[in-house]
Amino acid sequence: TLNSVLNSNAIKNLPPPLGGAAGHPGSAVSAAPGILYPGGNKYQTIDNYQPYPCAEDEECGTDEYCASPTRGGDAGVQICLACRKRRKRCMRHAMCCPGNYCKNGICVSSDQNNFRGEIEETITESFGNDHSTLDGYSRRTTLSSKMYHSKGQEGSVCLRSSDCATGLCCARHFWSKICKPVLKEGQVCTKHRRKGSHGLEIFQRCYCGEGLSCRIQKDHHQASNSSRLHTCQRH
């Protein structure tokens, strides 16, 4: 069973509110404590910035997408790149910044009236956590346009954070994805683990709110590495 992962006890001893989410600025989601996630500390100070390797868009921040840094570059080396603003060239929706989508190779506003019907989004992903079988496949996801016109409230299902209302992000909950609150100052957050520390991420949290970052709580510096408590703190 997945007792250690799915048990409500996994994150129930943390300070409220826990229905929400936590993490660090710019990242879409982070794992609940005790639940490993193949992430990394990608958001560092500018003078210490390092490209963050990724396998898929979901591993990058809400304002980023996952791709090879050079045109026609090695497909095996992908990093999180800054999203493309309106009127910039694109190949898929994830390349465009929140509030935009990719139409005819150009990022356009999703608020425009001509955004009707259904968008066909093709994403190729390689998957890992099967717990019995490992397989990779391509999937074509049909997104209904109504998701872009009516923003999801807390608890609503979503595909990405742009589907959720202001102050919410799209994060995994059990086996689905729902809109959860972005964390406020003092709320518990979770730093992504280093790449390679793979685990099943069942309860994701959002990132810390604007002007906040996920850092070790001062009185927890003495604690062992594994039990350090992180909270959203002012920069």
Epitope: S8, I11, G19, H131, T141, S156, V157, R172, F174, S176
Partner: antibody, heavy 117, light 112 residues
């Protein structure tokens, strides 16, 4: 209209294979995890398997591990259960169910699988 | 796995009289999101299970208000204020806080 429709059941000999399908409609299928649940004749309900919204995570009941494979095609709004090396004890009505994260949703009518020589 | 234990396993009720079914889980079903992932289903003869109550006490759409759910943590109860002939069948409690989802053994309700 929000609904789930299972199909693909039938009579099959022990050791053979069968593939069940579950067609979903009326909701954003690709945002939800999906489950298979079964019920043997005259018995209670038993959970079989789950797949995450994007197909990246799967988990199985011990009784079917290594024999059954759950998968999904989000472009077709369809959930699958590939059942190999079937045994008599797999005889049951199989239901697909949506992950219970927001509004609850009823199950489908189920599809009957009979494993018999 | 979380074990769900229902009682009684069978219940014979006079129409118009109340009925109560208990369900106990081997560990808390209260999630850190504040929700308690406990459900009640009714399976009428020859039909698939139909959802009655979700998250302990919320009636699913179309379910008569004579059905009510209560409880918290590990102890839950389904009450039928006045049993009607159409309420016969097997009632199951189910938890979804953890996979595998697990079900109670079922309570068979019949009319006297």
């Amino acid at each position: 209209q929000v609904q789930l429709v299972e199909s693909g059941g039938g009579v099959v000999q022990p050791g053979r294979s069968l593939r069940l399908s579950c067609a979903a409609s009326g909701f954003t299928f690709s945002s939800y995890g999906m489950h298979w649940v079964r019920q043997a004749p005259g018995k209670g309900l038993g959970w079989v398997a789950v797949i995450s919204y994007d197909g990246s995570d799967k988990y199985y009941a011990d009784s079917v591990k290594g024999r059954f494979t759950i998968s999904r095609d989000n472009s077709k709004n369809t959930l699958y259960l590939q059942m190999n090396s079937l045994r008599a004890e797999d005889t049951a009505v199989y239901y697909c169910a949506r992950d219970l994260v927001d509004t609850a949703m009823p199950w489908g009518q189920g599809t009957t699988v009979t494993v018999s020589s | 796995d979380i074990v769900m234990t229902q009682s009684p396993l069978s219940l014979s009720v006079t129409p118009g009289q109340p009925a109560s079914i208990s369900c106990k889980s081997s560990q808390s079903l209260l999630h850190s999101d504040g929700k308690t992932y406990l459900y009640w289903y009714l399976q009428k003869p020859g039909q698939p299970p139909q959802l009655l109550i979700y998250e302990v006490s919320n009636r699913f759409s179309g379910v008569p208000d004579r059905f009510s759910g209560s409880g918290s943590g590990t102890d839950f109860t389904l009450k039928i204020s006045r049993v009607e002939a159409e309420d016969v069948g097997v009632y199951y409690c189910m938890q979804s806080i953890q996979v595998p989802w697990t079900f109670g053994q079922g309570t068979k309700v019949e009319i006297k």
